[in-house]
Structures are given as structure tokens and as C-alpha cells.
């Protein structure tokens, strides 16, 4: 399969974020980052990592979404939702479900 | 297998123009960046263009900014090269090659571009 | 734009030599440096990626180091196929530049 060659010690990631030097990057690892600022869109931003493993494993939450992955270009087709608010009015367990 | 074929060289006038093409088959050509590259006759390498797997970003050569256009057509797994306003020393081999995205490493067989009155 | 330095510009050399070949970036590039081969007539091939990476099939007397600005390109001992013009490209920053390109020439 000529899209998966032999691993080396680093990956080869799509970038695409207002950072990147190039279209991609190279790093131990590949990242694609949900980010939603107040009163904007959310914004995907995809990239290398390198630092701080540890954001991989954390919950989306409304207002950010991190992802990692370990192989060559895996962050280039991977789509992210943030965690869904819910309105005052429709708190859990008072719908009669 | 991996393929990249080049075509849409030939002649052409100082201050012409020229399209280069790419066909790509055998790889996920959607997800990979890729770039044009140039020899001139008995010379180097001389990076030219690349653009990102989506086509949003796109990045040149200050000796071609301006004057050159990359795109891609994913539907099409085609990649292409807009030339504009050619000059003598525009006249090279031109290749289509997956670089920048190592360790993929396709290149096609080039076509040949000469800017000659 | 980075400049790439590369030397020298040709290289006499024979089979079973140790010969080493020079790349110098004008600014910081920390590893993010390739080799490229090319034979007449044929489009280059990709030998070591990433400063020391080797690229799958590649043979290991092929060795690459560097840091920063100055870089390396290693061949243990020549072999015949081995004759053919050396390239360093840097793709840590947009535009990328290659070097001028080392010809390997048998003496």
C-alpha cells in the first residue's frame, strides 16, 4: 500500500492553520484542533505535535476538540464536533425519558 | 502503482503562456501536498510551487510569484501549473512530485517547457 | 527566502571511497533538510528525509546529520550505482530551496 510506508521516528502531517511554514509538518505526532472563540465560528486548525501529549486525551468540550493521531498524514481527513450546549430550559432528566 | 504524468509543454514566445497538467493515480491524491519542480537544461533543481492536499494553501517561488498559478482538481486527481508571462529563463523540465510530503516520495517524468522566439 | 549552500560543487571519487557532501542554510532550518539523488535523464529520488531519516529502501550506506545550519550527507563506501548528482532541499520554511547540486563523478 504506497500510503503506508515503514514508520520512522517522526511523522509527516498535514498542516493547514495560520502557523504553518508549509502545507505540512513533520513531528512525533499529528493534531487536528477545534477551536470556537466567542461570537466566531469554530475554526479547525491541523497540525504537528510535539509537546504536551497529554491534550490528546482530553474531553471535548463546548469550546475546544484535540485530536491525535500517529501515523503519516492521518489528521488530513478527520472532521471534529465540539460538545453540544444545552439550554437552561432542557436540563437532563426533566423530558420524562 | 504510482503514477504522475505531466503534459501540456512545448514551445512558446517570450510573454506567452502555458498549462501544465499532472494526472496522478495508484495514491490518495487528496490527501497528499504536492509541488512542481524545474530543471533547466544542464542545470539544478529549482523548486518552483507547492500547494496543501485541499488546495487552500498554495506557496511559489519569489523567481515565479506573480506570473505562476498551482491548483488542483481533486475530483479529477489532477494537478496543475498556470503559466503566465514566460520568460527565456523559464525554459526547463518540469516535474509534478509529491514532495513536500515525506516519506512519500512520486515523481513524474517531467515535460519539457522552451521560452524561445 | 533561506539559501542553500552546497559542497562541492562536483566530487572525483572511487568505488569503496567514503565521501561526504555539505549543505549550509543561511538561517535556522532546525532538521527540517532532505537529500535527493538524480541520474541523467531521470527524476530525482528521495534518499533521507528529516536531516537522518532514511528513505524505505534506501541503503544504509547512505547517512545523513545536522542541526540548524549546517548539514551532512554520508556515503560508507561508493558503489557504482552511487555516481550521480546530489541535491539538499530545505522545506523548513515556503518558498523551499535546493542546493546547487553535487556531481559524483567516477576518478
Known amino acids: 500500500d504506497p500510503v503506508k510506508p515503514s514508520r520512522g521516528p517522526l511523522v509527516t502531517c498535514t498542516c493547514e492553520s495560520p502557523h504553518c511554514k508549509g502545507p505540512t509538518c513533520r513531528g512525533a505526532w499529528c493534531t487536528v484542533v477545534l477551536v470556537r472563540e466567542e461570537g466566531r465560528h469554530p475554526q479547525e486548525h491541523r497540525g504537528c505535535g510535539n509537546l504536551h501529549r497529554e491534550l490528546c486525551r482530553g474531553r471535548p468540550t463546548e469550546f475546544v476538540n484535540h485530536y491525535c493521531c500517529d501515523s503519516h498524514l492521518c489528521n488530513h481527513n478527520v472532521s471534529l464536533v465540539l460538545e453540544a450546549t444545552q439550554p437552561p430550559s432542557e436540563q437532563p432528566g426533566t423530558d420524562g425519558q | 502503482e504510482v503514477q504522475l504524468l505531466e503534459s501540456g509543454g512545448g514551445l512558446v514566445q517570450p510573454g506567452g503562456s502555458l498549462r501544465l497538467s499532472c494526472a496522478a493515480s495508484?495514491?490518495?491524491?487528496?490527501?497528499?501536498?504536492m509541488s512542481w519542480v524545474r530543471q533547466a537544461p544542464g542545470k539544478g533543481l529549482d523548486w518552483v510551487s507547492a500547494?496543501?492536499?485541499?488546495?487552500?494553501?498554495?506557496y511559489y517561488a519569489d523567481s515565479v510569484k506573480g506570473r505562476f498559478t498551482i491548483s488542483r482538481d481533486n475530483s479529477k486527481n489532477t494537478l496543475f501549473l498556470q503559466m503566465n508571462s514566460l520568460r527565456a529563463e523559464d525554459t526547463a523540465v518540469y516535474y509534478c512530485?509529491?514532495?513536500?510530503?515525506?516519506?512519500?516520495?512520486?515523481w513524474g517524468q517531467g515535460t519539457l517547457v522552451t521560452v524561445s522566439s | 527566502a533561506i539559501q542553500m549552500t552546497q559542497s562541492p560543487s562536483s566530487l572525483s571519487a572511487s568505488v569503496g571511497d567514503r565521501v561526504t557532501i555539505t549543505c549550509r542554510a543561511s538561517?535556522?532550518?532546525?532538521?527540517?533538510l532532505g537529500w535527493y539523488q538524480q541520474r541523467p535523464g531521470k527524476a530525482p529520488q528521495l534518499l533521507i528525509y528529516?536531516?537522518?531519516i532514511l528513505q524505505s529502501g534506501v541503503p544504509s550506506r547512505f547517512s545523513g546529520s545536522g542541526s540548524g545550519t549546517v548539514f551532512t550527507l554520508t556515503i560508507s563506501s561508493l558503489q557504482p550505482e552511487d555516481f550521480a548528482t546530489y541535491y539538499c532541499?530545505?522545506?523548513?520554511?515556503?518558498?523551499?530551496?535546493f542546493g546547487q547540486g553535487t556531481k559524483l563523478e567516477i576518478k
Open positions: 528529516a536531516t537522518s
Open positions: 512530485a509529491s514532495q513536500p510530503t515525506p516519506p512519500f516520495d512520486y
Open positions: 500547494i496543501g492536499g485541499r488546495g487552500g494553501s498554495t
Open positions: 495508484g495514491f490518495a491524491f487528496n490527501s497528499f501536498a
Open positions: 532541499l530545505q522545506d523548513y520554511n515556503y518558498p523551499c530551496n
Open positions: 538561517q535556522d532550518i532546525r532538521n527540517d
